[in-house]
Amino acid sequence: TEETIKFAAAHYNTEILKSIDNEWRKTQCMPREVCIDVGKEFGVATNTFFKPPCVSVYRCGGCCNSEGLQCMNTSTSYLSKTLFEITVPLSQGPKPVTISFANHTSCRCMSKLDVYRQVHSIIRR
Amino acid sequence: TEETIKFAAAHYNTEILKSIDNEWRKTQCMPREVCIDVGKEFGVATNTFFKPPCVSVYRCGGCCNSEGLQCMNTSTSYLSKTLFEITVPLSQGPKPVTISFANHTSCRCMSKLDVYRQVHSIIRR
């Protein structure tokens, strides 16, 4: 399907071509600011809550050009964020805790096979 | 627990409080730019593809202060975007199609019961 776009050009409105290209730009695979639910991210006990319940970090997102590709991080930094941790029943007040969150700094569209290999090589380490 | 935080706050480092407040701000329920998979959004035939496969629109996202609340849109506009539609087998080249996408313009944290009511009142219409 890629090739068909390359060869079918006659009589397209150039404004449409520009807007389509702009959509590619805006939806590319890149680090995007997302809200992460702290409890879900770390699988904490159900009686533990965080305030705020979410943090803002960058994670790879967007679309790849082909079904067989997946938007994956190629480099990661770690951000320390301080939150209030509340444990029920309240034996003490909220306590500040500093937690480290993965922050994706670069991304690439990878074949799903490469993603599988990458994940499994990390697990094997 | 909200009250507990307010009372405990007096004893915490102002830098910590500022960073926590900033996190609340960044993760609040509001319209956020997201990438929408066109095919999935409209449930199109499996032999139909779009180039680009995704579009960028605003949808409500972020976190609410309580488990029982959900971030929902309270107003929506519609954006027309032109994409290439490709149908396999290729009887013709990619054709430009204009599709309308829901774009959330305002959001609110609603109780899950209110969300249920809202969705069902739309369905009944």
Partner: antibody, heavy 122, light 107 residues
Framework: EVQLVESGGGLVQPGGSLRLSCAAS????????IHWVRQAPGKGLEWVGV????????YYADSVKGRFTISADTSKNTAYLQMNSLRAEDTAVYYC???????????????WGQGTLVTVSS | DIQMTQSPSSLSASVGDRVTITCRAS??????VAWYQQKPGKAPKLLIY???FLYSGVPSRFSGSGSGTDFTLTISSLQPEDFATYYC?????????FGQGTKVEIK
């Protein structure tokens, strides 16, 4: 300073191939469309095709469709025009040009290379 | 393809003259028209884009007007460096097409 420099022109026999390069500098390569325009000796300007180095989308004139391929290497800030099955009527000075990318309906070419001559003759 | 017909194909004028070149599109092209100046052995230079917008660094004696199918390039007071060939170009639809050119010569 924005610069486009073409290279790769020369004499080629009918049916032969040639690859032209357009090295870009002085601007963010992925922010502008890059066009190829040609001019036969003593004649007017003819648009050949265009690439968005960002998305890789390409569009061609009917006269070259299926014979010419435009590509871009974003790591080298270079666009290419691969010309196959060359004909005598492809003889021309080939220019690469940058789209001005103003917020308006069309394409306008604000920076041009110096041109490279392609002669197709036996 | 959209045809762009320029007139005249050549003209003779003197320094200080007001010169008008017209371009007619075979169908509506909105305001997606640009004008270029080309001197022998050199690459074309953009003068006007979007029918009437003066490109940066181009002297204000050049102006463009028109929309739809009829477009005009005007040089209000011809200067010695303005003797060249001028091309109009539409890019409302692909492929972008050029007029055949107007050669402005010294009278």
């Amino acid at each position: 300073e924005v610069q486009l420099v073409e290279s790769g022109g020369g004499l080629v026999q009918p049916g032969g191939s040639l690859r032209l390069s357009c090295a870009a500098s002085g601007f963010t390569f992925t922010d502008n469309w890059i066009h190829w325009v040609r001019q036969a000796p003593g004649k007017g300007l003819e648009w050949v095709g265009v690439i968005s180095p960002y998305s890789g989308a390409t569009y061609y004139a009917d006269s070259v469709k299926g014979r010419f391929t435009i590509s871009a290497d974003t790591s080298k800030n270079t666009a290419y025009l691969q010309m196959n099955s060359l004909r005598a009527e492809d003889t021309a000075v080939y220019y690469c040009a940058r789209d001005a990318d103003y917020d308006y309906a069309g394409w306008a070419f604000d920076y041009w290379g110096q041109g490279t001559l392609v002669t197709v003759s036996s | 393809d959209i045809q762009m017909t320029q007139s005249p194909s050549s003209l003779s004028a003197s320094v200080g003259d007001r010169v008008t070149i017209t371009c007619r599109a075979s169908q509506d092209v909105s305001t997606a028209v640009a004008w270029y100046q080309q001197k022998p052995g050199k690459a074309p230079k953009l003068l006007i884009y979007s029918a009437s917008f003066l490109y940066s660094g181009v002297p204000s004696r050049f102006s463009g007007s028109g929309s739809g199918t009829d477009f005009t390039l005007t040089i209000s007071s011809l200067q010695p460096e303005d003797f060249a060939t001028y091309y109009c170009q539409q890019s409302y639809t692909t492929p972008p097409t050029f007029g055949q050119g107007t050669k402005v010569e010294i009278k």
